[in-house]
């Protein structure tokens, strides 16, 4: 069934097969280089969808920049195909499945004085299942509460503070949320969870609850990139991939991350008996994308050169801020993950046959379900957890 996942995987986090830019991994590298010792966690699908929605209302060079930044070659795949692809993806992801819950949606908060283009509102509703809410931005505290409450409700309380402050000059806020909760196909036994050392660096050790389970896993040793990769399936179609670089090789692995690498890993997986030791952890990532995306070629939309005439007749709308927040928790019964991109316009958004594999130093993780739902680096597992023992 792993081969099926390889064939279906849209690794660019968009549904377009033809791309010149590895948006997901280029974005990862920008975030990683900006904060090399920090945890990283984001949802490529969420960010891509947010940008694609934005492109619906963008004109000329602004639209071109967004789509090219996403790595799309529109000669080979039409714009309509892109949006229809996201529409189909939303429908698929929102299908109720046993032991696997993923809800992904969009909302538009517009100032009472702003007239939105009907065509834009209609396309948002049809393609991105977007709700629209009239909002009084003059009451910035009330508006912020309205938006945060909405996101908190949609993400089952996992993202409660998407907006930390709100400029009363904001006229349109676009929110994109994703909530993911799934159980492992086979759960980890609580009795096997022990407090263990996690080496943040060779000198810095923190204690973490370390889950353990001996089982047959999809596994490979990538000698080129000097890392070990293990796939842990959820109920449903999603899989978590955990990548453990050899000592001192994190940067080498990060530099080698690409669509091609991920496909290779998924294709080369072999079933292997492993004693897997994985921290029980919680991390979150919060990013001001208006500072990040320009280095990926998406800059117009954040300046006075922005052409967002497809959204409103107001000629001076630009994206002043774009905030993306993602949270993940990994525990014995499954991984619960949540992400939100809010865009404000101000856009905010020991056995012979068994090998021991211990994630006791910084590692990478993916959650994939035909698309890359989440991508992250765990440099220091969060310890808001109750759990079992030590090495």
């Amino acid at each position: 069934e792993m081969k099926k996942r390889v064939e279906d995987l849209h690794v660019g986090a968009t549904v377009a097969p033809s791309s010149r830019r590895d948006f997901t991994f280029d974005l990862y590298r920008v975030l990683a280089s900006a904060a090399p010792s920090q945890n990283i966690f984001f949802s490529p699908v969420s960010i891509s969808m947010s940008l694609a929605m934005l492109s619906l209302g963008a004109g000329s060079s602004t639209k071109m920049q967004i789509l090219e930044g996403l790595g799309l070659n529109l000669q080979k795949s039409s714009e309509e195909e892109l949006h229809r692809g996201f529409q189909q993806l939303l429908q698929e992801l929102n299908q109720p499945r046993d032991g696997f819950q993923l809800s992904l949606g969009n909302a538009l908060f517009t100032d009472l004085v702003v007239d939105l283009q009907d065509t834009f509102v209609s396309a948002m509703k049809t393609l991105y299942l977007a709700d629209t809410f009239p909002t009084n931005f003059r009451d910035s505290a009330g508006a912020m509460k309205q938006i945060n409450d909405y996101v908190a409700k949609q993400t089952k309380g996992k993202i409660v503070d998407l907006l930390k402050n709100l400029d009363s000059n904001a006229v349109v806020i676009m929110v994109n949320y994703i909530f993911f909760k799934a159980k492992w196909e086979t759960s980890f036994n609580h009795k096997g969870t022990q407090e263990q050392d996690f080496y943040v660096t060779s000198e810095t050790v923190v204690r973490v609850p370390m889950m353990s389970r001996e089982d047959q896993y999809h596994y490979l040793l990538d000698r080129n990139l000097s890392c070990r990769v293990v796939g842990v399936p959820y109920q449903g179609n999603a899989t978590a991939l955990f990548i453990l670089p050899s000592e001192g090789k994190m940067q080498q692995v990060e530099n080698g991350l690409s669509e091609k690498t991920l496909r290779k890993w998924l294709k080369m997986f072999k079933k292997r008996q492993l004693e897997l030791y994985l921290p029980k952890f919680s991390i979150e990532g919060s990013y001001q994308l208006e500072k990040v995306l320009p280095s990926l070629g998406i800059s117009n939309v954040f300046t006075s050169h922005a052409d967002l005439s497809g959204i409103s007749n107001h000629s001076n709308i630009q994206v002043s801020e774009m905030v993306h927040k993602a949270v993940v928790e990994v525990d014995e019964s499954g991984t619960r993950a949540a992400a939100a991109t809010g865009t404000i316009f101000t856009f905010r958004s020991a056995r012979l046959n068994s090998q021991r594999l211990v994630f006791n130093r910084p590692f990478l993780m993916f959650i994939v379900d035909n698309n890359i739902l989440f991508l992250g680096k765990v440099n220091r597992p969060g310890s808001d957890y109750k759990d079992d023992d030590d090495k």
């Epitope: 050790v205 109750k386 023992d389």
Partner: antibody, heavy 119, light 106 residues
């Protein structure tokens, strides 16, 4: 069978140093931590520190840092605790214990070594 | 470092009586572990990760708690349970033990 065999009792003079051994059998010490614990007569347990041979990393309780020295020799599968500048406060039973992956930590203990510091 | 305070320091119980020993941590820990020690012997791991009984420990023992407050309970005291019990935290370095509770049989 997992076993930790500790060296015999020691009677030593104040100011001297002593090196205690903890020989492991039934497992490879490179794959597990070895912890050292002190118990003074009629007193409670005190964790001294531990050695992680795989990473070459040793952590001590600050109050034992500099006075006690944990080492190990993989070829003989033995861990050591060296106590220096001995005083009567060091009179105690010293235990080694094994960290655990597949079984809980501190499930296996040595029988203890009594160190008596006396003039 | 995390200080563990055990109470009571000494207690005696009659056979069949319910016994509870508590351990309070100076700051929150993930789990608590318990050891039994009898005179002249090495400590034995008794309960690990708050509530899991170590191999060979009778089912009349149980452990519970979270955060800073933990306890070990014997549902019905037996003569062989007379010993000193220590709690231990391993959530942060340095590991620490409680000062012990000496449990005697009446």
């Amino acid at each position: 069978e997992v076993q930790l065999q500790q060296s015999g009792a020691e009677l030593v003079r104040p100011g001297a140093l002593v090196k205690l051994s903890c020989k492991a059998s039934g497992f490879n010490i490179k794959d597990y931590y070895i912890h050292w614990v002190k118990q003074r007569p009629e007193q409670g347990l005190e964790w001294i520190g531990r050695i992680d041979l795989e990473k070459g990393n040793i952590i001590y309780d600050p109050k034992f840092q500099g006075k006690d020295n944990i080492t190990a020799d993989t070829s003989s599968n033995t861990a050591y605790l060296q106590l220096s500048s001995l005083t009567s406060e060091d009179t105690a039973v010293y235990y080694c214990a094994r960290g655990g992956y597949d079984v809980p930590s501190f499930a296996y203990w040595g029988q203890g070594t009594l160190v008596t510091v006396s003039a | 470092q995390i200080v563990l305070t055990q109470s009571p320091a000494i207690m005696s119980a009659s056979p069949g009586e319910k016994v509870t020993i508590t351990c309070s941590a100076s700051s929150s820990v993930s789990y608590m572990h318990w050891f039994q020690q009898k005179p002249g012997t090495s400590p034995k791991l008794w309960i690990y990760s708050t509530s899991n009984l170590a191999s060979g420990v009778p089912a009349r023992f149980s452990g519970s708690g979270s955060g800073t407050s933990y306890s070990l309970t014997i549902s019905r005291m037996e003569a062989e349970d007379a010993a000193t019990y220590y709690c231990q935290q391993r959530s942060s370095y340095p590991f620490t033990f409680g000062s012990g509770t000496k449990l005697e049989i009446k």
